[in-house]
């Protein structure tokens, strides 16, 4: 058994007061699929700004534009939803601001009443012009995939016309959709050609088809509903932290690990060590030493400070964070240079995040 155990009943033991972490929900920016979204990084005096999404570095691409302190997402999709962060790097320190992006078609419960154009969807025809059903507003039907957070209200619309006035019915997964198929039932607003489901749950996921018909014909349109579940998540670590560092023998160095967690996080700083000249025990497991962990007797656990370093301090340092949901870890390397060799500015080079995915 290794002389140093990574976790000996401490993995889940978070006692550090939560003031060090942004545990309260960050600001939420909402966009509908297809819309563009622009967010300004609300940090001052930023020399360099870096962006992450769900703890992973975010770079520019054909839909993501990064200009100064602005992030632009063009043609948003539900996949763009997540926890974003901008980090302002200054000459002496860095600061991170978190925000959520939610790309969804969800409406609030009252929104089904605000259809100012609803009456225009209900087209009255000259009684002589017999006509099979047709769509009157295809723009309102373009978004076929609706990804909606649980407990939100969903509205599907199929504005149609025809003569005589068509009737509308709804199918779920190709079968008649009955009120008893979901707790709380659903509403149909015939004059708005809409189906409304309040407080959606995971069992509401599926394909919803409106069938509009009269004696001259029938048309249909299918929407897909995905209910995005809402539950606490494991910790998220700021990408690129801790960062690689170098110093001379006798120097001091600091590693920083920035944590986002909506459940109280427990932080451990861990180093691979050697025993009897070996890095691994007889069972093949590495020897690991917990250098610091959050708790009553430890100061700011997000920072590991090493003073008067020796060559033996060189190596990989792991920031491991856990809550009762899960874990995340990232690591950085310390290079210790001989006294005569001045340290480079390697601290500005970030290590590749070592995710537990």
């Amino acid at each position: 058994r290794p002389s140093f155990s990574l976790v000996e009943d401490t993995t889940l033991e978070p006692e550090e007061p939560p003031t060090k972490y942004q545990i309260s929900q960050p600001e939420v920016y909402v966009a509908a699929p297809g819309e563009s979204l622009e967010v300004r990084c609300l940090l001052k005096d930023a020399a360099v700004i870096s962006w992450t999404k769900d703890g992973v570095h975010l770079g520019p691409n054909n839909r993501t534009v990064l200009i100064g302190e602005y992030l632009q997402i063009k043609g948003a999709t539900p996949r763009d939803s997540g926890l974003y962060a901008c980090t302002a790097s200054r000459t002496v320190d860095s600061e991170t601001w978190y925000f959520m992006v939610n790309v969804t078609d969800a409406i609030s419960s009252g929104d089904d009443e605000d259809d100012t154009d609803g009456a225009e969807d209900f087209v009255s025809e000259n009684s002589n012009n017999k006509r099979a059903p047709y769509w009157t507003n295809t723009e309102k039907m373009e978004k076929r995939l609706h990804a909606v957070p649980a407990a939100n209200t969903v509205k599907f619309r199929c504005p149609a016309g025809g003569n005589p006035m068509p009737t509308m019915r709804w199918l779920k997964n190709g079968k008649e959709f009955k009120q008893e198929h979901r707790i709380g039932g659903y509403k149909v607003r015939n004059q708005h050609w809409s189906l409304i489901m309040e407080s959606v749950v995971p069992s509401d996921k599926g394909n919803y088809t409106c069938v509009v018909e009269n004696e001259y014909g029938s048309i249909n349109h299918t929407y897909h509903l995905d209910v995005v579940e809402r539950s606490p998540h494991r910790p998220i670590l700021q990408a690129g932290l801790p960062a690689n560092a170098s110093t001379v023998v006798g120097g001091d160095v600091e590693f920083v690990c920035k944590v986002y967690s909506d459940a109280q996080p427990h932080i451990q700083w861990i180093k691979h060590v050697e025993k009897n000249g070996s890095k691994y025990g007889p069972d093949g497991l590495p020897y690991l030493k917990v250098l610091k962990h959050s708790g009553i007797n430890s100061s700011n656990a997000e920072v590991l400070a090493l003073f008067n370093v020796t060559e033996a301090d060189a190596g990989e340092y792991i920031c491991k964070v856990s809550n009762y949901i899960g874990q995340a870890n990232q690591s950085a390397w310390l290079t210790v240079l001989p006294k005569q060799q001045a340290p480079g500015r390697e601290k500005e080079i970030t290590a590749s995040p070592d995710y537990l995915e």
């Epitope: 009943d9 033991e13 606490p232 899960g326």
Partner: antibody, heavy 113, light 107 residues
């Protein structure tokens, strides 16, 4: 969707051991703690311990640390809870739970001579 | 270990009533508290996490409040399906202790 399916009821004699399984599906097994909770007949809930399947990290309630062993098999997405040296007060329903959000149906263990 | 004390241990109420259950921690647990509902012969169901956040698929008549040592679960208008036992749980530090439970019965 997320599912945790536990093994069936067990009847054991005092001093014996029991191994309860909890098979997970519908999510990335490695990424979430699996917790075990005991509920004796007519009693409340008691946390026994947890395991993180990705690396096997475990944490135990001191009351169960000596007799309970949690293991995970990532190849089958299954977690096991073994309880040794059984006594009558171990008669209970044992639940596994993914981060307390999703729960198994429970496994009844009866210890009787 | 952190002790969790729930009150009352049982209560009788009618459909439509507003019901409040309290939970007190023996020390500061910040917002690290979950609430569960359990019906006979069934596994517990997560209602509220992080003291105030409604879990998936939980009706909005349930709400949680409090931080530090004092917490409350409120059911704004009791429904027939809400008659059950409710537990609070410390999720700040191990062992993750539960309250003794509050049984909500039909008056």
């Amino acid at each position: 969707q997320v599912q945790l399916v536990q093994s069936g009821a067990e009847v054991k004699k005092p001093g014996a051991s029991v191994k309860v399984s909890c098979k997970a599906s519908g999510y990335i097994f490695r990424n979430y703690y699996i917790h075990w909770v005991k509920q004796a007949p007519g009693q409340g809930l008691e946390w026994m311990g947890a395991i993180y399947p990705d690396n096997g990290d475990t944490s135990y309630n001191q009351r169960f640390k000596v007799r309970a062993t949690l293991t995970a098999d990532t190849s089958t997405s299954t977690v096991y809870m073994e309880l040794s040296s059984l006594r009558s007060e171990d008669t209970a329903v044992y639940y596994c739970a993914r981060a307390f959000t999703y729960w198994g149906q429970g496994t009844t263990v009866t210890v009787s001579s | 270990d952190i002790q969790m004390t729930q009150s009352p241990s049982s209560l009788s109420a009618s459909v439509g009533d507003r019901v409040t259950i309290t939970c007190r921690a023996s020390e500061n647990i910040y917002g690290a508290l979950n609430w569960y509902q359990q019906k006979p012969g069934k596994a517990p169901k997560l209602l509220i996490y992080g003291a105030t956040n409604l879990a998936d698929g939980v009706p909005s008549r349930f709400s949680g409040s409090g931080s530090g040592t004092d917490f409350t679960l409120t059911i704004s208008s009791l429904q027939p399906e809400d008659f059950a036992t409710y537990y609070c749980q410390n999720v700040l530090s191990t062992p993750y202790t539960f309250g003794g439970g509050t049984k909500v019965e039909i008056k």
